[in-house]
Interface confidence: low
């Protein structure tokens, strides 16, 4: 292809310096904090007779860098040190031997703001492309996680809630997911970009907040989304279902065993008593179920322990309306095991329990 035919392909900035060495790259790129960007880049250089068989090394430097003194932010030269603050985050993704200088930035940080220039070295042929330079702008993280609730939430029925950050990139440090909820929960599996929370709502969880917080540790930035739980009640005869969760709240991690109490308990023996009585008896025990982090999982995927140890069901024969009780689900300690209690009512309006003790579930 005649060289003259290539001229229309060149950007004006590329020709401004030296027509022997030219580079095509967008002059500005914007990336949100914690996220990533791939900047396409092509460069050309003549290959002298004495360097035809030499390997090509590419380097990205910060503007103002002195080649002989300063380390690059990224390079394909294996034995070359790179800047500590960009190590593992800036990558020369392109293959310089194919004239590709594409730069990948992951876990973008505020201090990545600035201009960068590319340099090639092939044997004794060395050149720094001072124009055009790449200007990187790191802005606030405005993306927020998405919480998906399949179907409706019914008291006593477990549902898998998914918190996803589909806008995050595969190459970055996997984010840390944290869930905050008053409702009985445990962790389900996770992927790089999503976390599943198994929730078993109680009537009093209606209208309470559930938060999914996502921390991009690579950049030290956090984003979250909070929703209000909408727990619906299926009209039916009042029944009580006792369905234990993982009573111990134990979860194996690489770091060891993390103990946690998620909250909500019922005792079969007390079911025959008035619900109001239960409410007042156990109110004082409530504070013993502490706000606890249930798990910090470093493995992928993460599976929370949600399998029941035993199942009991019994019918409650009693008043269908107990206004003084307002659907309270007390928490008690028994034999160091916690159980979830669920009461199904029809036509009841549960009030929020102002002393609800939240539990936090983290997954990484």
């Amino acid at each position: 292809m005649p060289l003259l035919l290539l001229l229309p392909l060149l950007w004006a900035g590329a020709l401004a310096m030296d027509p022997n060495f030219w580079l095509q790259v967008q002059e500005s790129v914007t990336v949100q904090e914690g996220l990533c960007v791939l900047v396409p880049c092509t460069f050309f250089h003549p290959i002298p007779y004495y360097d035809k068989n030499s390997p090509v090394h590419g380097y990205w430097f910060r503007e103002g860098a002195i080649i002989s003194r300063d380390s690059p932010v990224a390079t394909n030269k294996l034995d070359q040190e790179v800047q500590e603050e960009t190590q593992g985050r800036f990558r020369l993704l392109g293959d310089p031997s194919r004239n590709n200088c594409s730069l990948s930035i992951v876990d973008a940080r505020r201090r990545d703001n600035g201009s960068y220039f590319f340099r090639m070295e092939r044997g004794s042929t060395k050149y720094s492309y001072k124009s055009p330079q790449l200007s990187v702008h790191v802005t606030d993280l405005t993306h927020r996680p998405k919480i998906l609730i399949p179907g409706t939430l019914e008291p006593g029925h477990s549902k898998n809630l998914t918190c996803s950050v589909s806008w995050a990139c595969e190459q970055g440090t996997p984010p840390i997911f944290s869930w905050l909820s008053a409702a009985p929960t445990s962790l389900g599996p996770r992927t790089t970009h999503s976390s599943v929370l198994i929730i078993t709502p109680r009537p009093q969880d209606h209208g309470t907040n559930l938060t999914c917080q996502v921390k991009f540790a690579g950049a030290g930035v956090t984003t979250e989304r909070t929703i209000q739980l909408n727990v619906t009640y299926v009209p039916q005869n009042p029944t009580t279902g006792i369905f234990p969760g993982d009573g111990s709240g134990k979860q194996e991690t690489r770091a060891g065993v993390v103990h946690g109490a998620i909250g909500g308990a019922g005792v079969t023996a007390l079911l025959a008593l008035c619900l109001c009585l239960i409410f007042f008896i156990v109110k004082t025990h409530r504070r013993k179920a502490a706000r606890t982090a249930v798990g910090r999982n470093d493995t992928h995927p993460t599976t929370g322990s949600a399998s029941p140890k035993h199942q009991k069901k019994s019918k409650l024969h009693g008043p269908t309306e107990t206004s003084s009780c307002s659907g309270a689900a007390p928490t008690v300690e028994m034999d160091e095991e916690l159980h979830y209690a669920s009461l199904n009512f029809h036509g009841m309006n549960p009030s929020k329990d102002t002393s609800t003790e939240y539990s936090e579930v983290r997954t990484q």
């Epitope: 027509p19 050309f44 003549p46 290959i47 007779y49 004495y50 035809k52 004239n99």
Partner: antibody, heavy 117, light 111 residues
Framework: QVQLVQSGAEVKKPGASVKVSCKAS????????YHWVRQAPGQGLEWIGF????????GYAQKFQGRVTMTVDTSTSTVYMELSSLRSEDTAVYYC??????????WGQGTLVTVSS | DIVLTQSPDSLAVSLGERATINCRAS??????????MHWYQQKPGQPPKLLIK???FLESGVPDRFSGSGSGTDFTLTISSLQAEDVAVYYC?????????FGQGTKLEIK
């Protein structure tokens, strides 16, 4: 400003050797290659070889292989070209030329070497 | 070795007229990006002076009446409007491989 200043004219007898110098100034000496090109009276340009001071790479035309040696003294920013076993047909103006990549952007003024018995 | 053949050997052109010098390489000296061919001007008693690099790029400081074109094996140096100071010998040179070689030269005179 960029300058390549060569040593003065030489008259040599056949079979002798000649060493021509080329002193560079006005830029970073080791960033460039240095070539030697000769021109016989009334004739065209003939490439002899090159040297790259920063890593000692050299390359010579086959015709001069074994007779030519190019060296460099980075402390004085000087390149040298020594041609041995001189013959009458080696009579020529010898130029040193600077090369950024592979064209010659600056040339010395030339050194006339006359080989005569 | 790559042989460069210039044509014509000598050329006489009137002032203000166009002068065209050709250079043919015995093998391809171009890639998709670059043509490794350069042009020099040499006036009597002076060293050569670089005019055009990589077939078509004008060296800085060279008047824009000089231009270069071509790829592969055939290259052209053009002087769009001949001036008196353009009287010289013109050489093409390749840098595709060792040895580097020059064309035999084209002598340009004023008609």
């Amino acid at each position: 400003q960029v300058q390549l200043v060569q040593s003065g004219a030489e008259v040599k007898k056949p079979g002798a050797s000649v060493k021509v110098s080329c002193k560079a100034s006005g830029y970073t000496f080791t960033d460039y290659n240095y070539h030697w090109v000769r021109q016989a009276p009334g004739q065209g340009l003939e490439w002899i070889g090159f040297i790259y001071p920063s890593n000692g790479i050299t390359g010579y035309a086959q015709k001069f292989q074994g007779r030519v040696t190019m060296t460099v003294d980075t402390s004085t920013s000087t390149v040298y070209m020594e041609l041995s076993s001189l013959r009458s047909e080696d009579t020529a103006v010898y130029y040193c030329a600077r090369s950024d990549v592979d064209y010659f952007d600056y040339w010395g003024q030339g050194t006339l070497v006359t080989v005569s018995s | 070795d790559i042989v460069l053949t210039q044509s014509p050997d000598s050329l006489a052109v009137s002032l203000g007229e166009r002068a065209t010098i050709n250079c043919r390489a015995s093998q391809d000296v171009s890639t998709s990006t670059y043509s490794y061919m350069h042009w020099y001007q040499q006036k009597p008693g002076q060293p050569p002076k670089l005019l055009i690099k990589y077939a078509s790029f004008l060296e800085s400081g060279v008047p824009d009446r000089f231009s270069g074109s071509g790829s592969g094996t055939d290259f052209t140096l053009t002087i769009s409007s001949l001036q008196a100071e353009d009287v010289a010998v013109y050489y093409c040179q390749h840098s595709w491989e060792i040895p580097l070689t020059f064309g035999q030269g084209t002598k340009l005179e004023i008609k």
